[in-house]
């Protein structure tokens, strides 16, 4: 049986949309599947790598690599999207290309970044972890760390940094899929909202879905002890 909830929820484009949340009901009138997984149920994606989920994550990452920051022209906010999802008339899509990106490092101004921009994250404005020396962030946004400390400046002069961010990574469903969404949408979908991150590649959704002890390597499920828990 399914339990369907419909509600008007604030979505990425800044408008309220009618959204359906479908929950698989427990046949025995007990905890939901997500709660059972959290409690230690034998859920194979938490025990070993699941090919389907791995493919999903790789697909999400490939899409994200090509994303940019969609900044609303009316200054209402910005969100990380694909170019096709960013209005050509109502917004500006900030994407580094044709030598418009910042240099990889100040020691070599000639080598420009082509991956990015990312809403509210930029190697030029992040103090911790700083992109410098032996720790230069790669020219692949899906390999960027979470910036834990921004340069102390209320305005950077960068469109993708000075805007109000409207969406962050949200881990939805037992498949560990990730979407950049508003907090409202994420909470309605019973997802896990990552306030600290800017990109889906910075979060490990399956780790959140599985709960219990975190994986030793966030990319590799290793909860074999589930076999004895349930």
């Amino acid at each position: 049986a399914q339990h369907v909830t419909t509600q008007l929820v604030l979505r990425n484009k800044g408008v309220y949309e009618s959204v359906k949340y479908i929950q698989q009901e427990n046949f025995w009138i007990g905890p939901s599947s997500i709660d059972l997984i959290h409690l230690g149920a034998k859920f194979s994606p938490c025990i070993r790598k699941d090919q389907q989920i791995e493919q999903l994550v790789l697909r999400e990452r490939d899409l994200e690599r090509d994303s940019g920051c969609c900044v609303q022209n009316d200054h209402s906010g910005c969100i990380q999207t694909q170019r096709k999802d960013c209005s050509e008339t109502l917004a500006t899509f900030v994407k580094w290309q044709d030598d418009t990106g910042p240099p990889m490092d100040k020691s070599d101004l000639g080598q420009k970044r082509t991956s990015g921009a990312v809403c509210h994250q930029d190697p030029r404005t992040c103090e911790e972890p700083a992109s410098s020396g032996a720790h230069i962030w790669p020219d692949d946004i899906t390999k960027w760390p979470i910036c834990t400390e921004q340069a102390k400046s209320n305005r950077t002069g960068f469109l993708h940094m000075d805007c109000q961010i409207k969406g962050r990574p949200c881990c939805i469903s037992t498949k560990g899929s990730c979407e950049i969404t508003t907090r409202e949408y994420c909470e309605f979908m019973h997802g896990y909202f990552h306030e600290e991150a800017t990109l889906c590649s910075q979060v490990h959704c399956l780790d959140k879905v599985c709960g219990l002890l975190p994986f030793l390597n966030p990319e590799v499920p290793d909860q074999f002890y589930r076999l004895w828990l349930s």
Epitope: D98, D99, T100, G101, P103, K106, S107, L109, G110, K112, R124, T125, E127, A130, S132, A151, K152, T156, G157, F158
Partner: antibody, heavy 120, light 107 residues
Framework: QVTLRESGPALVKPTQTLTLTCTFS??????????VGWIRQPPGKALEWLAH???????YYNPALKSRLTISKDTSKNQVVLTITNMDPVDTATYYC????????????WGQGTLVTVSS | EIVMTQSPDFQSVTPKEKVTITCRAS??????LHWYQQKPDASPKLLIK???QSISGVPSRFSGSGSGTDFTLTINSLEAEDAATYFC?????????FGQGTKLEIK
């Protein structure tokens, strides 16, 4: 507000070493992404970038003059010092210090400049 | 090094006129170009960054355009106070280099 001020001798003799000091206020050279450097302008001519020093001690010099230039900073005194060895009459110019940022590698604040004449 | 060439070297214009100054780079520099204004006996002042991005406090009559090797600084409806020398600067690679300047005289 941000201000920078250059100081040093107005006249130096050929072969001598020029020492210029830039004293600034309104920001700290320990602040992430900021640097201070020197640009010169011979009378009636174009600007020429000489050197920059960054918040993290990184230094960059114009390759054409690198062997003659040394830049250093004293963060506690809010000062940057440039020395140019073996001065020549062609080095006669107004020397400016300016703040630079890694945000765009442009100079957003400049000192008023100091004219240095090289003559015997 | 990247050589920046401005044209014209000198321009005499009347107030309210539209003025364009061009800057050409010896190689493609993307949008890594900045414009400065230097009034007589004064230090340079940043007008435009990244070829077209305005700087706060700079009058809106100043605008920039271009990418690659060709760039333009436009002054719409020139005012007497705009008499100055204008320089372009590339930040595409070290060493940072400037154009030779364009002197603007108000008739």
């Amino acid at each position: 507000q941000v201000t920078l001020r250059e100081s040093g001798p107005a006249l130096v003799k050929p072969t001598q070493t020029l020492t210029l000091t830039c004293t600034f206020s309104g920001f700290s050279l320990s602040t992430f992404a900021l640097g201070v450097g020197w640009i010169r302008q011979p009378p009636g001519k174009a600007l020429e970038w000489l050197a920059h020093i960054w918040w993290d001690e990184d230094k960059y010099y114009n390759p054409a003059l690198k062997s003659r230039l040394t830049i250093s900073k004293d963060t506690s005194k809010n000062q940057v010092v440039l020395t140019i060895t073996n001065m020549d009459p062609v080095d006669t110019a107004t020397y400016y210090c300016a703040r630079i940022t890694t945000y765009y590698y442009g100079m957003d604040y400049w000192g008023q400049g100091t004219l240095v004449t090289v003559s015997s | 090094e990247i050589v920046m060439t401005q044209s014209p070297d000198f321009q005499s214009v009347t107030p309210k006129e539209k003025v364009t100054i061009t800057c050409r780079a010896s190689q493609s520099i993307g949008n890594h170009l900045h414009w400065y204004q230097q009034k007589p006996d004064a230090s340079p002042k940043l007008l435009i960054k990244y070829a077209s991005q305005s700087i706060s406090g700079v009058p809106s009559r100043f605008s920039g355009s271009g990418s690659g090797t060709d760039f333009t600084l436009t002054i719409n409806s020139l005012e007497a106070e705009d008499a100055a020398t204008y320089f372009c600067q590339q930040s595409y690679n070290w060493p940072l280099t400037f154009g030779q300047g364009t002197k603007l005289e108000i008739k």
